[in-house]
């Protein structure tokens, strides 16, 4: 708390502007008006206050809106943002993705910091889905922003919004996440043909069950070695050696330097030793041939 | 008086790693920024990454972005860097300083970290 | 990055001569500059913050002026102890960069 003093006399501000600079914390407290600063926020960022001149404007803003800021001041804040708490931005309303890409701005460059997050989640949650200019915008400042949300989180992601969404954006989604955003992005892309759709597909493939990697085998689509190593290891084990070579096309001779990894190693102990000997890669560790092969897990279905 | 006082510099293999402390005196360390900032011997000065007084706002310069990591410890009064993968061009003399957003106004001596095999 | 450039990159002058050294940025900078002192062997000394002001405890012999991309520190008459460098900064954004010096020497 900065102490009630007396603004001395001629000290007293009539604008927001460079003299502030040198005024003392005590000073500014008494000399600035809050509501003259509440209408020349957009002044504040272009002048070279310190951080603890800014911790005075703050407070004097919180005087002033002790219910939390009107759009029309978060919009302007600019570097005061950093200087907020999530409990602050907790008592925000904002609505328009325009102050939502002034704030995202001042932080550019930081790592996300608890400030953004929370300001995010109230944003996201103020407009009750996650459209796509939002998406658009959170994956512009943040690309690892869609993997960082729950499974939960994800659900409430409008298909139409997949089409914001780029490569880079899911590198760090685990297969939980991906088993959400898949369904969405093949309503999103259904569309597309053949070619073109494997190209939006493709990076969302994480979450595609068998049947669905069945059909993408019979497309020539050419799927390379990282995308097939990023597939569900319960969604591969039923492919064929036929519909795996189909799949990957001429990137098949791949499987041989991963044969020792997920899911690769285990889809191969899955398969005929002479149905990989087909591929003529030299894959080993398949069921030796006259063995009878049960599938436990129909069995189990069954029962 | 107000002071800050480096450690952990010295000789370190390329591709090892350091960590750089920074003890603060005579202010209310919690209530300011800081920054880490390098001189290589006969060069200039470069700023490489700042933390805000509650630790929730970090930036690094790109040349050490991934490498090191800036921390602080408020209870402590303490100022950290972390410093992994380490090159030749990291050799420097490494400052702390209270970092008042418009200047830096108080300096560390400096510690010197030397990158060589 | 903003780009700080100083010039001269180095000067001779005798004790009692006034002294100007100029920093230009590569783009605007409003009043975000810093000038700073460095003796060798030294960390550096904050001068003059927010492009013009004295920073407590610094004589006021140092002064800066100027905003947006052009500004100068002068010292108004040196003194003895005022042979060093002296660097500018800019913190206008990030990452934050200095100018590479002028060195003040002894004629």
């Known amino acids: 708390e900065v102490e009630k003093t007396a603004c001395p006399s001629g000290k007293k501000a009539r604008e927001i502007d460079e003299s502030l600079i040198f005024y003392k914390k005590w000073e500014l407290e008494a000399c600035v008006d809050a509501a003259l600063l509440a209408t020349q926020m957009d002044r504040v960022n272009a002048i070279p206050f310190t951080y603890e001149q800014l911790d005075v404007l703050k407070h004097k803003l919180d005087e002033l809106y002790p219910q939390g800021y009107p759009e029309s001041v978060i919009q302007h804040l600019g570097y005061l943002f950093l200087k907020m708490s999530p409990e602050d931005i907790r008592k925000w309303n904002v609505t328009s993705l325009e102050t939502l890409k002034a704030l995202l701005e001042v932080n550019k460059g930081h790592e996300m910091s608890p400030q953004v997050a929370t300001l995010i989640d109230r944003f996201v949650k103020g407009r009750g889905q996650l459209d796509k200019d939002t998406l658009d915008t959170l994956t512009a400042f943040y690309p690892g922003y869609l993997c960082s949300l729950s499974p939960e989180e994800l659900s409430s992601v409008p298909p139409s919004s997949i089409w914001a969404v780029r490569p880079q954006d899911l590198d760090t989604c685990d297969p939980r996440q991906l088993d959400v955003l898949y369904p969405k992005a093949r309503l999103a892309f259904q569309n597309m043909n053949g070619s073109e759709y494997f190209v939006k597909i493709q990076s969302f493939l994480g979450g595609a069950p068998t049947e669905d990697l069945k059909a993408l085998s019979q497309q020539n689509v050419s799927m390379d070695l990282a995308t097939f190593m990023k597939l569900r290891t319960d969604a591969v084990l039923p492919l064929t050696v036929a519909e795996v070579q189909k799949l990957l096309g001429p990137h098949v001779e791949g499987l041989k330097a991963e044969e020792r990894h997920r899911p690769v190693r285990d889809w191969i102990l899955r398969q005929r030793q002479d149905d990989l000997d087909t591929l003529g890669l030299g894959l080993q560790g398949g069921i030796p041939n006259g063995y009878l092969v049960l599938d436990l897990s129909m069995q189990e279905a069954l029962s | 008086q107000v002071q800050l006082v480096e450690s952990g510099g010295g000789l370190v293999k390329p591709g090892g790693s350091l960590r750089l402390s920074c003890a603060a005196s005579?202010?209310?360390?919690?209530?300011?920024?800081m920054s880490w900032i390098r001189q290589a011997p006969g060069k200039c000065l470069e700023w490489i990454s700042y933390i805000s007084n509650s630790g929730s706002t970090i930036y690094y310069a790109d040349s050490v972005k991934g490498r090191f990591t800036i921390s602080r410890d408020n209870a402590k009064n303490s100022l950290y860097l972390q410093m992994n993968s380490l090159r030749a061009e990291d050799t420097a003399v490494y400052y702390c300083a209270r970092d008042q957003r418009n200047a830096f106004d108080i300096w560390g001596q400096g510690t010197m970290v030397t990158v060589s095999s | 990055a903003i780009q700080m450039t100083q010039s001269p990159s180095s000067l001779s002058a005798s004790v009692g001569d006034r002294v100007t050294i100029t920093c230009r940025a590569s783009q605007g900078i409003g009043s975000w500059l810093a000038w700073y002192q460095q003796k060798p062997g030294k960390a550096p000394k904050l001068l003059i913050y927010?492009?013009?002001g004295l920073q407590s405890g610094v004589p006021s012999r140092f002064s800066g002026s100027g905003s947006g991309t052009d500004f100068t520190l002068t010292i108004s008459s040196l003194q003895p102890e005022d042979f060093a460098t002296y660097y500018c900064?800019?913190?206008?954004?990030?990452?934050?960069?200095f100018g590479c010096g002028t060195k003040v020497e002894i004629k």
């Open positions: 927010a492009a013009s």
């Open positions: 005579g202010f209310t360390f919690s209530d300011h920024y």
């Open positions: 900064q800019q913190s206008y954004s990030n990452p934050l960069t």
